[in-house]
Amino acid sequence: NADGLKEPLSFHVTWIASFYNHSWKQNLVSGWLSDLQTHTWDSNSSTIVFLCPWSRGNFSNEEWKELETLFRIRTIRSFEGIRRYAHELQFEYPFEIQVTGGCELHSGKVSGSFLQLAYQGSDFVSFQNNSWLPYPVAGNMAKHFCKVLNQNQHENDITHNLLSDTCPRFILGLLDAGKAHLQRQVKPEAWLSHGPSPGPGHLQLVCHVSGFYPKPVWVMWMRGEQEQQGTQRGDILPSADGTWYLRATLEVAAGEAADLSCRVKHSSLEGQDIVLYWEHHSSVG
């Protein structure tokens, strides 16, 4: 993908609300372009915080001001509504509500939108077309919640419009505004270390790869040209500077480490793979 982000691309907003008791609650709101956080919500000032210079996309100040107003109104309304109906819905304190909503892009075209709400980490209700529907597994509580949510058609009209119209327009503008940043290529650094000993006479070899962008990367322990199937890839983890980190480990008998190497392929390397040989590495870590 030219934008350095894997298809399908999505923009989504997440709202995590923790209800500790009837009067004490907390919430976290964030906006994401695929796995890159682009926005956060400052509850104290009821303002959207733009985390990247291009996070405004092509929306005007007036549009942002209106979106801020809607988020403020809806956060207050949602908290109040959930608090009011908690007993009726058999929500037991402390509980957590997670909401994620946004839209997806396939080959530069909007392919759909989504809005889901989870209660205590389980699917509860979702927004389809122009109304809320319960997840069948969520039972009668979810059905009742939908009945409450669907009482206000104006609310649903705004929600539908945000998902079907505002979000698709925004993601396209965001990709355009962030093009230079998203299309950048940052070369990885790699180094080798010992991991914790897996047992007597065995070694854990660790290949660290850090500071690369975009995210797709190939890392493998090799013996000559032979890929070592025992290679364990960790999760690709985010770094504070917007690049990525990954470690790949391999367990081997102590005498079999000598001719092993770690090979790293990444788009920024333009075919010039990084190859690090275990026998050359100095004992660090």
């Epitope: 007036e62 549009e63 209106e66 979106l67 107003t69 809607l70 403020r72 109104i73 207050i76 309304r77 109040e80 122009n130 206000n152 058609q153 104006h154 609310e155 009209d157 705004i158 539908h160 419009n161 945000l162 079907s164 119209d165 505002t166 327009r169």
Partner: antibody, heavy 123, light 107 residues
Framework: EVQLVESGGGLVQPGGSLRLSCAAS????????MTWVRQAPGKGLEWVAF??????????ESNPAVKGRFTISRDNAKNSLYLQMNSLRAEDTAVYYC??????????????WGQGTLVTVSS | DIQMTQSPSSLSASVGDRVTITCLAS??????LAWYQQKPGKAPKLLIY???RLKEGVPSRFSGSGSGTDYTLTISSLQPEDFATYYC?????????FGQGTKLEIK
């Protein structure tokens, strides 16, 4: 620049019909809900009806006071909004305004208004 | 339908005065309130939305406040061009409803 221009008002007898038009320009018409609001002489404002945008499937919503008598519609090719008024009553006498929200989000906060067209229902 | 009750219905004030107009909704409208200014023979003009957000281009002497069912429009220092009729409007639920208006006149 957003422009809304109403036309079609006039004098009509009780029980009669009239069709109002609103010509829109300066924005992508299909992205917006479009609304009619009226104001009886010397009285306050009253929301009449709206028609949703493309994302909303161009469906309509109207005030119970006019439901069944007034029909809102749009011609997207002509960037035009209409209000077909049937079975008119004396209490429908008002200036009819065409209005639009600030952005494409149907907040109900009307930032753009036409100049209005006067409908008088009298025998 | 949500009823919107504005008070006072008319008000006499002088240039430089601080003026307050209130709007009472028949149920909680969660900040979903707009204020409009209308001059004779003209269309209404949006001043405030979301209860307290000033529309771009509107002078900062206008401010909105309130929550729940009670909302207020304040003009901190009246200017000659502010003499007009003011309306509140709820857009919390359909049908949208307006207050009956407050006519602000020169004393």
């Amino acid at each position: 620049e957003v422009q809304l221009v109403e036309s079609g008002g006039g004098l009509v007898q009780p029980g009669g019909s009239l069709r109002l038009s609103c010509a829109a320009s300066g924005f992508t018409f299909t992205d917006h809900y479009m609304t009619w609001v009226r104001q009886a002489p010397g009285k306050g404002l009253e929301w009449v009806a709206f028609i949703r945008n493309k994302a909303g499937g161009y469906t309509t919503e109207s005030n119970p006071a006019v439901k069944g008598r007034f029909t809102i519609s749009r011609d997207n090719a002509k960037n035009s909004l209409y209000l077909q008024m049937n079975s008119l009553r004396a209490e429908d006498t008002a200036v009819y305004y065409c209005a639009r929200e600030t952005t494409g989000i149907p907040t109900g906060w009307f930032a753009y208004w036409g100049q209005g067209t006067l409908v008088t229902v009298s025998s | 339908d949500i009823q919107m009750t504005q008070s006072p219905s008319s008000l006499s004030a002088s240039v430089g005065d601080r003026v307050t107009i209130t709007c009472l909704a028949s149920e909680d409208i969660y900040f979903d309130l707009a204020w409009y200014q209308q001059k004779p023979g003209k269309a209404p003009k949006l001043l405030i939305y979301g209860g307290d957000r000033l529309k771009e281009g509107v002078p900062s002497r206008f401010s909105g406040s309130g929550s729940g069912t009670d909302y207020t429009l304040t003009i901190s220092s009246l200017q000659p061009e502010d003499f007009a009729t003011y309306y509140c409007q709820q857009s919390y639920s359909y049908p949208y409803t307006f207050g009956q208006g407050t006519k602000l006149e020169i004393k």
